[in-house]
């Protein structure tokens, strides 16, 4: 049957997520050759990032543990050109990359991207150094975009007896302190695979001790209120779950949130069918449950964050992770995360190498960017519950929140339903009483053009989404439905529905 009845639970919020629930990352590999960090000076990129504020910007990834801060390192020519062009002007308002520098970097980027992906696949990582200027570029990007920077420190700098050597971190802290930078911190990336990446085995207890040491450093500096997040472990398979448990026992007290990473697929082998498969989407549920089991058994009540996540690891799946098809995984992950109590979800990556970026190498927003922007504008922090009546629920996936009260079009008490249709026919959703006769605004996303689900362009309610200019995002125009309408959701599409004047007490 193509008409589907929904049930809502709106008595009280199941969870409260962060206003920065949907957050983003910049992979630390962008600093492998620090010249490419200058791309973050693009006004267009900042406009796009600003659209997702409030959010965290996590600078991290495998390269985290192969980057060394060198305060004496000279700026590159490109960095110098960039900073010189900003002299005597408001960098957030007028800052831009000198056109010749931008052109040069963009021409060289495809080669750099190949190099980074090759390094990743060969698992041969070399140390690189970054300068004060690199830190400045990164912080300026975050600050000008209204994002809160989380910086990943190198955890593979070790003494002979495998204690963490904090001296390089101290240099960076001192520099950031001197500049008055407000930064949160992480230590290490996917420590469960250090052995594979660097022939060094660090157990969870040792890592916990290292975090305690970093926490002490932070308390001694001007960063005494700085937040510390970790341990950024990978998926909770047996050894990783064990590592997380021993880490939390040893060092869990000093972290502000527990971070872990999740990918559905291997980017090299993923198929379009995988991206549309509810079995694949449901794998995430058991991963979340495992993490919560570990956290609740060691540090009950500690907040859990997805510190890095996307559709497929290894830079994403070519011709899939940057298309409309990727939105099914992304929206479902956001919905499940909120429903299961994850406070923040950090999308790998905002901009950078691979295919899972929100913004491409030309600084053009991809379908998942527009999906993220809509999510930001419409979805509030109070998480409620929607479900499909009957047994066939897995291909029609529905989530419910209070509406984002920062949206001037809506008011407290309104509801935002978001829904994913993986069926090959249109489904018609019927709202439960007393919402069935409310005015509903529809925000339907469909792919544009002949590539269908593999399109890199998207339409909102039939209108193509594109930037007005480098400084301006387009209006996100709702399509109001007649009160009492069923909510039509076409085959292989996803949509937000704002139920206006819902007057839900839990949302007020």
């Amino acid at each position: 049957q193509d008409v589907v009845d929904l049930d809502f639970f709106t008595q009280e919020p199941l969870h409260l997520v962060s206003p920065s629930f949907l957050s983003v990352t910049i992979d630390a590999n962008l600093a492998t050759d620090p010249r490419f960090l200058i791309l973050l000076g693009s006004p267009k990129l900042r406009t796009l990032a600003r659209g997702l504020s409030p959010a965290y910007l996590r600078f991290g990834g495998t390269k985290t543990d192969f980057l060394i801060f060198d305060p004496k390192k000279e700026s590159t020519f490109e960095e110098r050109s960039y900073w010189q062009s900003q002299v005597n002007q408001d960098i957030c308002k007028y800052g831009s990359i000198p056109p010749d520098v931008e052109e040069k970097l963009r021409l060289e980027w495809p080669y750099q991207e190949q190099l980074l992906l090759r390094e990743h696949y060969q698992k041969k990582f070399k140390n690189s150094t970054y300068s004060r200027s690199s830190v400045d570029v990164l912080y300026t990007f975050a600050n000008c975009s209204g994002l809160d920077l989380i910086f990943g420190l190198n955890a593979l700098l070790r003494t002979a007896d495998l204690q963490w050597n904090s001296s390089n971190a101290q240099l960076l802290l001192d520099y950031c302190s001197s500049k008055g930078y407000n930064i949160s911190w992480e230590l290490g990336n996917e420590p469960n695979s250090f052995l594979k990446k660097a022939d060094i085995f660090i157990n969870g207890s040792q890592l916990g001790e290292d975090f305690i040491q970093l926490h002490k450093l932070l308390r001694k500096s001007t960063f005494k209120n700085a937040k510390l997040y970790g341990p950024d472990v990978g998926q909770p398979r047996r050894k990783t779950a064990k590592m997380l448990k021993s880490f939390l026992k040893a060092g869990g007290e000093v972290i502000d949130s527990v971070t872990w990473h999740h990918y559905y697929l291997n980017g090299r082998t993923a198929t379009k069918e995988d991206f549309l498969n509810p079995d694949v989407l449901d794998i995430f549920i058991s991963s979340v449950q495992k993490v919560f089991q570990v956290v609740e058994s060691t540090r009950p009540g500690k907040k859990v964050w997805l510190g890095e996540t996307s559709s497929a690891y290894g830079g994403g799946a070519p011709l899939l992770s940057d298309t409309f098809a990727a939105g099914f995984m992304w929206l479902d992950k956001l919905g499940l995360s909120a429903r299961m109590g994850i406070e923040v979800v950090m999308r790998q990556v905002f901009f950078g190498a691979g295919n899972y970026h929100l913004v491409d190498e030309n600084f053009d927003p991809l379908p998942d960017y527009w999906l993220s922007l809509l999510f930001k504008k419409l979805v509030g922090t109070k998480v409620l519950m929607a479900s499909v009546q009957g047994s066939k629920r897995r291909k029609l996936r529905v989530y419910l929140h209070c509406t984002n009260t920062d949206n001037p079009r809506y008011k407290e008490g309104d509801l935002t339903l978001y829904a994913i249709n993986l069926h090959n026919v249109t489904k018609y959703l019927r709202l439960p009483y007393p919402f069935s006769n409310k005015q509903v605004d529809k925000y339907l996303l469909r792919p544009l053009g002949p590539h269908g689900l593999l399109s890199k362009s998207v339409q909102l309610n039939g209108l193509t989404l594109k930037m007005v200019d480098d400084q301006t995002l387009p209006p996100l125009m709702e399509k109001p439905l007649r009160p009492g309408s069923s909510l039509g959701l076409p085959a292989f599409s996803y949509s937000f529905f704002v139920i206006r004047n819902a007057k839900v007490a839990a949302c007020i």
Epitope: D2, Y428, S486
Partner: antibody, heavy 122, light 111 residues
């Protein structure tokens, strides 16, 4: 094929009543919202009333509110318009029309009947 | 007086392009409710020509197109043909009236 056939029109005196019917075939009637639209001689189209696919909602134009009643019998695949207290200005061709998407999710009218003429005259 | 305002008539020579406007208010077209267009040939029932602002039902030639901006919508017909001579109506939903509303209709004459 998909078809709507109106009946019940005729000449009636002001203040009297008339009931129009619209027989549907060729589609799942119970899945579609249905409307009545009228057209006075030489004039434009005027929307009259709508009934949801399951009969749960009914709405009327101000000009007929309180006098006309829209109803449906899904078991008989038939739409009705009960017209009471008829006036001269109700003289028109009355069309029934189907919504363009099921379950009252669209207000475009993709299928129209041929119309039935109602003349209110003393 | 119709809620949606259309010009009473427009005309064009065969092969030309004509547009028919439909102006509403903030409670119908301006609220971004869907606009639909109908063609009514003499002595026949109306036929859906454009639905949802700019979508053509199957069988409608691509010479017909719809657009919308602000409180107005337009129907454009390119490559005008003799058989296009008919009355054209726009329709939308009006939230203040809780019902559908039509324009007064536009008679298209092919010269």
């Amino acid at each position: 094929q998909v078809q709507l056939v109106e009946s019940g029109g005729g000449v009636v005196q002001p203040g009297r009543s008339l009931r129009l019917s619209c027989a549907a075939s060729g589609f799942t009637f119970s899945s579609y919202g249905m409307h009545w639209v009228r057209q006075a001689p030489g004039k434009g189209l005027e929307w009259v009333a709508v009934i949801w696919y399951d009969g749960s909602n009914k709405y009327y134009a101000d000009s007929v509110k309180g006098r006309f009643t829209i109803s449906r019998d899904n078991s008989k695949n038939t739409l009705y318009l009960q017209m009471n207290s008829l006036r001269a200005e109700d003289t028109a061709v009355y069309y029934c029309a189907r919504e363009g998407a099921p379950y009252s999710s669209s207000d475009a009218f993709d299928i129209w009947g041929q119309g039935t003429m109602v003349t209110v005259s003393s | 007086q119709s809620v949606l305002t259309q010009p009473p008539s427009v005309s064009g020579a065969p092969g030309q392009r004509v547009t028919i406007s439909c102006t509403g208010s903030s409670s119908n077209i301006g609220a971004n409710y869907d606009v639909h267009w109908y063609q009514q040939l003499p002595g026949t029932a109306p036929k859906l020509l454009i639905y949802g602002d700019n979508n053509r039902p199957s069988g409608v030639p691509d010479r017909f197109s719809g657009s919308k901006s602000g409180t107005s919508a337009s129907l454009a017909i390119t490559g005008l043909q003799a058989e296009d001579e008919a009355d054209y109506y726009c329709q939308s939903y009006d939230s203040s009236l809780s019902g559908s509303v039509f324009g007064g209709g536009t008679k298209l004459t092919v010269l």
